[in-house]
């Protein structure tokens, strides 16, 4: 009886040992397969990310091309309209002019006296810039650089007047402290009669013969 039990126990031990061994093999196989699956998943993820990135870049490029195309189209139709128009108002801003809130602006890089700058703008069917708001002031300041720059404001004929007839008294102003001082010490038969943006954007009145930069402004046809 005893030997029979011992035999059965031995048989059970062998069976269990085999079972453990085969289970271990299967667990290892499953683990290995799991690792492969994980790696495959990661690979698929990175491929997906790359494709997404490529698609996003292609989309950005496409958007850019569409925007450029629309801009070119608008510019072309604008120039065609300008050819048919009488030239009294701009249907679009000329090359090298900047558009802002329905007006076109040209920023000089050289220096001229106020009268010469005024004449230059008129020959371009424009006028020296008239500042109507804080926002327009900021736009001009951003583009003009840290250099004294003439604007279309003068008191050569008495009171301060904007060249386009905009009312000075009720309009936007941005003078430096103590300005305008209409300094008469220069003996030019009048005070400092022309206004300019200083390097920090605030306004000063100065002798009109100074060789400062200037900004021309022209209204754009609101219909386009």
């Amino acid at each position: 009886q005893n030997s029979k039990l011992r035999g059965e126990l031995q048989a059970l031990r062998e069976t269990f040992s085999n079972f453990t061994a085969s289970t271990e093999v299967e667990v290892k196989a499953l683990s290995s397969q799991g690792g492969n699956v994980g790696r495959k998943m990661k690979s698929l993820e990175s491929q997906l990310e790359k494709q997404q990135k490529d698609l996003s870049e292609d989309h950005s490029d496409l958007l850019l091309h569409v925007k450029q195309f629309v801009s070119d189209l608008r510019s072309l139709s604008c120039q065609i309209a300008a050819l048919h128009g009488n030239g009294s108002t701009l249907t679009c801003c000329p090359v090298n002019w900047l558009e802002y809130e329905g007006s076109c602006y040209w920023f000089s890089r050289s220096g001229k006296s106020w009268p010469e700058a005024d004449k230059y703008c008129q020959l371009e069917s424009a006028h020296l810039v008239v500042v109507n708001s804080r926002e327009e002031q900021k736009f001009i300041q951003h583009h003009m650089g840290p250099v004294n720059t003439w604007m279309g404001l003068t008191d050569q004929s008495g009171p301060w007047k904007w060249v386009d007839g905009t009312d000075y008294e009720t309009g936007f102003k941005n003078w430096r402290p103590e300005q305008p001082d209409d300094w008469y010490g220069h003996g030019l038969g009048g005070g400092e009669d022309c206004a300019h943006f200083t390097d920090d954007g605030r306004w000063n009145d100065d002798v009109c013969q100074r060789p400062y930069r200037w900004v021309c402004e022209a209204a754009r046809d609101p219909a386009t």
Partner: antibody
Amino acid sequence: QVQLVESGGGVVQPGRSLRLSCAASGFTFSSYGMHWVRQAPGKGLEWVAVIWYDGSNKNYADSVKGRFTISRDNSKNTLYLQMNSLRAEDTAVYYCARDQGVGYDGLDVWGQGTTVTVSS
Amino acid sequence: DIQMTQSPSSLSASVGDRVTITCRTSQGIGKYLAWFQQKPGKAPKSLLYKVSSLQSGVPSKFSGSGSGTDFTLTISSLQPEDFATYYCQQYMTYPLTFGGGTKVEIK
């Protein structure tokens, strides 16, 4: 300290060319306008040319217009004066000078000068 | 071009004297007038700008005044180192122009 050093002067025949240089140090060169001023032997000072801080504006005395060209290289802190079709009356000491501002504010610092002699 | 006329063209003075040099312009130049000092064989030195503003490092014995077309440079008490030639210059507009110079000599 702020310093301007001219070079390139010498003896040259009428009709020939010469290029003067002015090396700047001790200040932010690209923020200032620069001038050339000359002085003929025994005579007073004569302004020659100006170039604005960024090279955008250049102005010349009538006596050199069309013959002289002022230029600058802000990356090298150097000012130049290219002198073509030189004449006897161009004989002078040439000074480079710094503008107090971007190019329309008068002169505050001067170099020691370089001598140009135009003679056959 | 704006013409600059300096007077006198030369003057003799003694140490301690008060000296005044005049500069007249052919048209008004605002406040855009400068004065320079030049000694023989040396580069000009900036003394004053905007009519009366002293360049840094320049002693207060130098002063400038004037308006319109008439300007003056004053040396309150002449010292040995002040014997030199003095030039005025306008920088209101291009071309910049200089006066003919005033030579200050020892009496």
